[in-house]
């Protein structure tokens, strides 16, 4: 089949990094500078992506693969193949359509991207707040209020030691 195909279409013999040049009797010509072909049998080479402005080059273009971009510091990638660069915010903020805004009271964001999320509601798990939340950090839940009542120890007693050679029941 391969031999039949190559008899029918001489372009199928052109490897990645070349194109089938109709102007030169379908000879396989190397891709010109700043272009590439990632598969064989191509009749044209694709123009290399240029990483300019807020985009920076993560991987240079070669004759067989396109350039890859990422974003300059202060931005992060969005979209397939880093087609967009979105600004970072500080911890304790979220990106709105009009820019970075502080998290509202009762919410936090511990990352430079994403949205502010509500603090954990400790009481839903029957626990109390051990450390208050901030714009940058969630609350830390501690033992339940009952565990902290007078006379109750907040220290968990150690598990009884097992005798050597005895498997647990």
């Amino acid at each position: 089949f391969e031999r039949t195909r190559s008899l029918q279409d001489p372009c199928s013999n052109c490897p990645a990094g070349t194109f089938c040049d109709n102007n030169r009797n379908q000879i396989c010509s190397p891709c010109p500078p700043n272009s590439f072909s990632s598969a064989g049998g191509q009749r044209t080479c694709d123009i290399c992506r240029q990483c300019k402005g807020v985009f920076r080059t993560r991987k240079e273009c070669s004759s067989t693969s396109n350039a890859e971009c990422d974003c300059t510091p202060g931005f992060h990638c969005l979209g397939a193949g880093c087609s967009m660069c979105e600004q970072d915010c500080k911890q304790g903020q979220e990106l709105t359509k009009k820019g970075c805004k502080d998290c509202c009271f009762g919410t936090f964001n511990d990352q430079k991207r994403g949205i502010c999320r509500p603090w954990t509601n400790c009481s839903l798990d029957g626990k109390s707040v051990l450390v208050n939340g901030t714009k940058e950090r969630d609350v830390v839940c501690g033992p339940s209020p009952a565990d902290l009542s007078p006379g109750a120890s907040s220290v968990t007693p150690p598990a009884p030691a097992r005798e050597p050679g005895h498997s647990p029941q």
Partner: nanobody, 124 residues
Framework: EVQLLESGGGLVQPGGSLRLSCAAS????????MSWFRQPPETGLKWVSS????????YYADSVKGRFTISRDNSKNTLYLQMNSLRAEDTAVYYC?????????????????WGQGTTVTVSS
């Protein structure tokens, strides 16, 4: 598969006009707010405009207010951006975006699908 396909970009002289379109497929278009964002060559992605699901409420960035108009045709599953009095600083790749459940105004940022973009160049 959810898809957004922009068209209508091109080269235009300062003061000129362009109309961008965004054809949506793979979801119930009339249920969702939609937005336009743009990525200028030298800076990060910027929000341009949003429209609610029905088309009744529209929102604009200060930099385009009075010059750009967002609209939608729910019967054609298409979003539009009419851009008038274009300036050099409007040069960018323009992206159509589907909003999630919270992105109905000019503050919440809740994009869950992006288009592939269309390039607008404003130059004399």
């Amino acid at each position: 598969e959810v898809q957004l396909l922009e068209s209508g970009g091109g080269l235009v002289q300062p003061g000129g006009s362009l109309r961008l379109s965004c054809a949506a497929s793979g979801f119930t278009f009339s249920n969702y707010a939609m937005s336009w964002f743009r990525q200028p060559p030298e800076t990060g992605l910027k929000w341009v405009s949003s429209i609610d699901a029905s088309g009744g409420d529209t929102y604009y960035a200060d930099s385009v207010k009075g010059r750009f108009t967002i609209s939608r045709d729910n019967s054609k599953n298409t979003l539009y951006l009419q851009m008038n009095s274009l300036r050099a600083e409007d040069t960018a790749v323009y992206y159509c975006a589907k909003e999630g459940s919270h992105g109905t105004d000019d503050s919440h940022y809740d994009v869950d699908v992006w288009g592939q973009g269309t390039t607008v160049t404003v130059s004399s």
